[in-house]
């Protein structure tokens, strides 16, 4: 788990409610699933389903759980030690360089190309030239052959935040 979980909001500032468990820091840090108190004397548990921390830390507030966008499915819920895992719905994918939204997979390859890779939650269909075997750039063609892709098969999640 990485320490800096990008684009995560902090949970709103909160005083420890009576139901939140407290324990003492170990060697000055608090364990996963907790944050440190302002005086550094206590570890306060994160709230299940609301916020989390993934590692030993001196965070003053736990990190807010991600909510899956429309067009995404929740692979695993947010716990006190792990953020929500969201994945693009079948037939859509999220590229590393544009992670903000799921995009529709192409339904087929351009003329003169054959499909060698299916639509997955993290990649579009893959097309190569029939002759040379070189990959297609990925731009949606003006004319498509009737080479259709099968729906994306669930595999490893495309956005693991936490």
């Amino acid at each position: 788990e990485s320490a800096l979980i990008t684009q995560q909001d902090l949970a709103p500032q909160q005083r420890a409610a009576p139901q939140q468990k407290r324990s003492s820091p170990s060697e000055g840090l608090c364990p996963p699933g907790h944050h440190i108190s302002e005086d550094g004397r206590d570890c306060i548990s994160c709230k299940y389903g609301q916020d989390y921390s993934t590692h030993w830390n001196d965070l003053l507030f736990c990190l807010r759980c991600t909510r899956c966008d429309s067009g995404e499915v929740e692979l695993s819920p947010c716990t006190t030690t792990r953020n929500t895992v969201c994945q693009c719905e079948e037939g859509t994918f999220r590229e590393e360089d544009s992670p903000e939204m799921c995009r529709k997979c192409r339904t087929g390859c351009p003329r003169g190309m054959v499909k060698v890779g299916d639509c997955t939650p993290w990649s579009d269909i893959e097309c190569v030239h029939k002759e040379s075997g070189t990959k297609h750039s990925g731009e949606v063609p003006a004319v498509e052959e009737t080479v259709t892709s099968s729906p994306g098969t669930p595999a490893s999640p495309c956005s693991l935040s936490g």
Partner: antibody, heavy 119, light 106 residues
Framework: EVMLVESGGGLVQPGGSLRLSCAAS????????MSWVRQAPGKGLEWVAT????????YYPDSVKGRFTISRDNAKNTLYLQMSSLRAEDTAVYYC????????????WGQGTLVTVSS | DIVMTQSPSSLSASVGDRVTITCKAS??????VAWYQQKPGKAPKLLIY???TRHTGVPDRFTGSGSGTDFTLTISSLQPEDFATYYC????????FGQGTKVEIK
Amino acid sequence: EVMLVESGGGLVQPGGSLRLSCAASGFTFSSYVMSWVRQAPGKGLEWVATISSGGSYTYYPDSVKGRFTISRDNAKNTLYLQMSSLRAEDTAVYYCARRGDSMITTDYWGQGTLVTVSS
Amino acid sequence: DIVMTQSPSSLSASVGDRVTITCKASQDVGTAVAWYQQKPGKAPKLLIYWASTRHTGVPDRFTGSGSGTDFTLTISSLQPEDFATYYCQQYSSYRTFGQGTKVEIK
């Protein structure tokens, strides 16, 4: 008087390794959470690593995770930063820093040691 | 991660001037903000923590204020030794710093 003195910086090639040290004095070293913070030439400050007072727990930002390792020897009052797979963007002055009592932030810093990653 | 936007990036002032530096957090950080002073080739020095608490030995001409996302460091009457670069830092979620404000002699 709290004193933190870094050493071990220098010129290293991309992909290379380097170990920085920070000698602490003037306080009970084993009681304090310690960190490394860096400052690239002409740039702002960036947190690099944190270690618990006893050395059992560490954490890092994504930018260095898996490449840098923070450690400490409380018997020698020394903090370390082992850096590997160094990149040009790791070029910076590296400071060791102490987390203060009941303030959850850095109260004392060393003078820094310059690490230059270049071929 | 939380971005701290500091302004101005530099300013020119004279001894005795009142100087104000601001820092804006990209999200609510409560009062978990510190201010540091750094002179060339020297270690940063803690001035203010918890947004408004002066560190030991810091002159009372340095005042910090703010909460949530907007923070200010004020030097009420600039002294010759105050010409330096000042950084804000949030420590609510890990540690991130502003880009610095260089206070120069006018």
